[in-house]
Amino acid sequence: QRLSRAQQQLPLESLGWDIAELQLNHTGPQQDPRLYWQGGPALGRSFLRGPELDKGQLRIRRDGIYMVHIQVTLAICSSTSTSRHHHPTTLAVGICSPASRSISLLRLSFHQGCTIASQRLTPLARGDTLCTNLTGTLLPSRNTDETFFGVQWVRP
């Protein structure tokens, strides 16, 4: 679809092309499996254009269909710790609030590896907060080329 000259001069946010790419800030305290994210040009190659961070969790500000992607690499990992010796380490991405829209969007297991990556298209609504839960005792890398999380608005 071609954009008019007036549309070309508008910022991307006003066109609905919301996008965010985040890097890992820290893991949660005991009993909190969530990963806490951060983004902004001062931090490197992470940014938010439309979506916002609420206490380290990503909140959507515009309805639409989004591509959600995530990669997590474990800094503390083991060929056995991802299977026999520990509870299975899994990563789940889901809508965690509002409670009425709570649902799992992505679920991945590390099995024998130390890196997982996935993406999917899914409808998201304004106010949806996405949580990324890492269950199991292993510790993710904060290297920005190993662990990252993002969303991209695709269409209404």
Epitope: T27, A75, S141
Partner: antibody, heavy 120, light 108 residues
Framework: EVQLLESGGGLAQPGGSLRLSCAAS????????MSWVRQAPGKCLEWVSA????????FYAESVKGRFTISRDNSKNTLYLQMNSLRAEDTAVYFC?????????????WGQGTLVTVSS | EIVLTQSPGTLSLSPGERATLSCRAS???????LAWYQQKPGQAPRLLIY???SRATGIPDRFSGSGSGTDFTLTISRLEPEDFAVYYC?????????FGCGTKVEIK
């Protein structure tokens, strides 16, 4: 300047307990995973235990699992190692060590160590 | 558990000479997650190299690391008097994290 200062070492009876502390300064303590590493007299280095920056994840060597507990108090910038059911083979200098920011467990700063002697 | 074997146990060299220290792993080290440390008597270890070949902050460029898989090397291009110490390798790609038992570099 990053500083790590261990304390709490000393003489303990076999089967006894000790609690080691490591006071940290010069960096944002809560942002870094930490480990304890020990070295028996004239012997190799041995990793003992690690803990994430938030304290939510802990890791142990098989030789200490079930006997030692690692913890941290981020409000006090202090790392702990509670050592129970001590054995003669736990005799060593215990170092606290800071992980890299990435969380990877190579150790860019170490304390000077505290000596634990287990003997009757 | 990955066992690290360092060789030789002792290296007798003179200042200005080149030192080559070996660290061999019992199985492949994930992504070359191997570090080297220097330790002098009565002191804590000091990080020299991480990721098999990256020099830690403040480490002189006469120290270099190389290798991947199961075979790793620390090279000191020209030994200075302060380099005589014990050197340890450590793998951190797999739990539990393990150290070699060290190579002592002594003055000939």
């Amino acid at each position: 300047e990053v500083q790590l200062l261990e304390s709490g070492g000393g003489l303990a009876q076999p089967g006894g307990s000790l609690r080691l502390s490591c006071a940290a300064s010069g960096f944002t303590f809560s942002s870094y995973a930490m480990s304890w590493v020990r070295q028996a007299p004239g012997k190799c280095l041995e990793w003992v235990s690690a803990i994430s920056g938030s304290g939510g994840s802990t890791f142990y060597a098989e030789s200490v699992k079930g006997r030692f507990t690692i913890s941290r108090d981020n409000s006090k910038n202090t790392l702990y190692l509670q050592m129970n059911s001590l054995r003669a083979e736990d005799t060593a200098v215990y170092f606290c060590a800071k992980h890299d920011y990435s969380n990877y467990p190579y150790f860019d700063y170490w304390g000077q160590g505290t000596l634990v002697t287990v003997s009757s | 558990e990955i066992v690290l074997t360092q060789s030789p146990g002792t290296l007798s060299l003179s200042p200005g000479e080149r030192a080559t220290l070996s660290c061999r792993a019992s199985q492949s080290v994930r992504s070359s997650y191997l570090a080297w440390y220097q330790q002098k008597p009565g002191q804590a270890p000091r990080l020299l190299i991480y990721g098999a070949s990256s020099r830690a902050t403040g480490i002189p460029d006469r120290f270099s690391g190389s290798g991947s898989g199961t075979d790793f090397t620390l090279t000191i291009s020209r030994l200075e008097p302060e380099d005589f110490a014990v050197y340890y390798c450590q793998q951190y790609g797999d739990l539990p994290f393990t150290f070699g038992c060290g190579t002592k570099v002594e003055i000939k």
